[in-house]
């Protein structure tokens, strides 16, 4: 078990803070919830603290919760490939470019680390080149989320990882908006981290609304499990 992994044996409080600017529309989001890495689960509630969110909530899911991939459940035979927990408590910087097909792009930079007993994800997001009547600024996405695989590989030069995946957002007319994600994570501290063999995270997400919440918000439940590396032969014959 890595030193960082020991921090994730119980239920951990999570705080998410985002400052965003998309085509000049500035906004802030605050999120709060809990994570349980034993089961690979997160439950979070996000509130737009500046009024109405100028982009659809589903376009921010990867920035919020795929940002705290340290809560992914890594099976016993894969624990030596869990970069995310090994970087804790000092944490990691997570940078992404997200290209929305036939539309604009988001660039994000986040610091994910422990502040006391709370896992904090502080994010800056800049979005450019979006069409005012497109699927994103035109709010044409359905309020739901598909399952995805998130592909991870080591980046030995930077002592971190590179990650890429394609998100499929459902559009109200029945079509799909694709969003290509290019991600890199580098540790904040200078302690040892685990550099993984190639594998993926399998994600399932459910979006809902709190019936008692009047502000623009999103409730998120997520279930994430690492996969893609089989037991070694020595494991099979134990």
């Amino acid at each position: 078990m890595s030193k960082g992994e020991e921090l994730f044996t119980g239920v951990v409080p999570i705080l998410v803070e985002l400052d965003g600017d998309v085509n000049g529309h500035k906004f802030s989001v605050s999120g709060e919830g809990e994570g349980d890495a034993t089961y690979g689960k997160l439950t979070l509630k996000f509130i737009c603290t500046t009024g109405k969110l100028p982009v659809p909530w589903p376009t921010l899911v990867t920035t919020f919760s795929y940002g705290v991939q340290c809560f992914s459940r890594y099976p016993d035979h894969m624990k030596q490939h869990d970069f995310f927990k090994s970087a804790m408590p000092e944490g990691y910087v997570q940078e992404r470019t997200i290209f929305f097909k036939d539309d604009g792009n988001y660039k994000t930079r986040a610091e994910v680390k422990f502040e006391g007993d709370t896992l904090v994800n502080r994010i800056e997001l800049k979005g450019i080149d979006f069409k005012e009547d497109g699927n994103i600024l035109g709010h044409k996405l359905e309020y739901n989320y598909n399952s995805h695989n998130v592909y991870i590989m080591a980046d030995k030069q930077k002592n971190g990882i590179k990650v890429n995946f394609k998100i499929r957002h459902n559009i109200e007319d029945g079509s799909v908006q694709l969003a290509d994600h290019y991600q890199q994570n580098t540790p904040i501290g200078d302690g040892p981290v685990l550099l993984p063999d190639n594998h993926y995270l399998s994600t399932q997400s459910a979006l809902s609304k709190d019936p008692n919440e009047k502000r623009d918000h999103m409730v998120l439940l997520e279930f994430v499990t690492a996969a893609g590396i089989t037991h070694g032969m020595d494991e099979l014959y134990k």
């Epitope: 119980g10 239920v11 809990e34 994570g35 689960k41 459910a206 809902s208 439940l221 279930f223």
Partner: nanobody, 122 residues
């Protein structure tokens, strides 16, 4: 569990003493023949806030007795479409509030009871 005529009432109870750690959320799910397991109601163990599936709102009431570590589901005005196996479940995490709890997937929960059959005849 049990059998009852349409319009009747039943009360389900579930002991939570076997859970490994005190749950943040407890819930009832149900599974009718040939259908997926769906959420019926959930209750936040610390605050007592409750959420229901649209199909049972106003008819079912979820409650807890923390002293006895027991979860209850009071089911009134039962309909034939309420026929299913009912499961008690719990999560270490707090509840996921939802306007319609039926849309919360089963993976929200960590621990599951064995299930009890409820049959409502017309």
């Amino acid at each position: 569990g049990g059998s009852v005529q349409a319009g009747g009432s039943l009360r389900l109870s579930c002991s939570a003493s076997g859970f490994a750690s005190s749950p943040g959320c407890m819930a009832w799910f149900r599974q009718a023949p040939g259908k997926e397991r769906e959420g019926v109601a959930e209750i936040a163990t610390r605050s007592g806030s409750a959420y229901y599936a649209d199909s049972v709102k106003g008819r079912f009431t979820i409650s807890q007795d923390n002293a006895k570590n027991t979860l209850y589901l009071q089911m009134n005005s039962l309909k034939p479409e309420d026929t299913a196996i009912y499961y008690c479940a719990a999560s270490r995490l707090r509840c996921t509030p939802a306007a319609d709890f039926s849309r919360i997937p089963a993976y929200a929960m960590d621990y599951w009871g064995k299930g009890t059959q409820v049959t409502v005849s017309s």
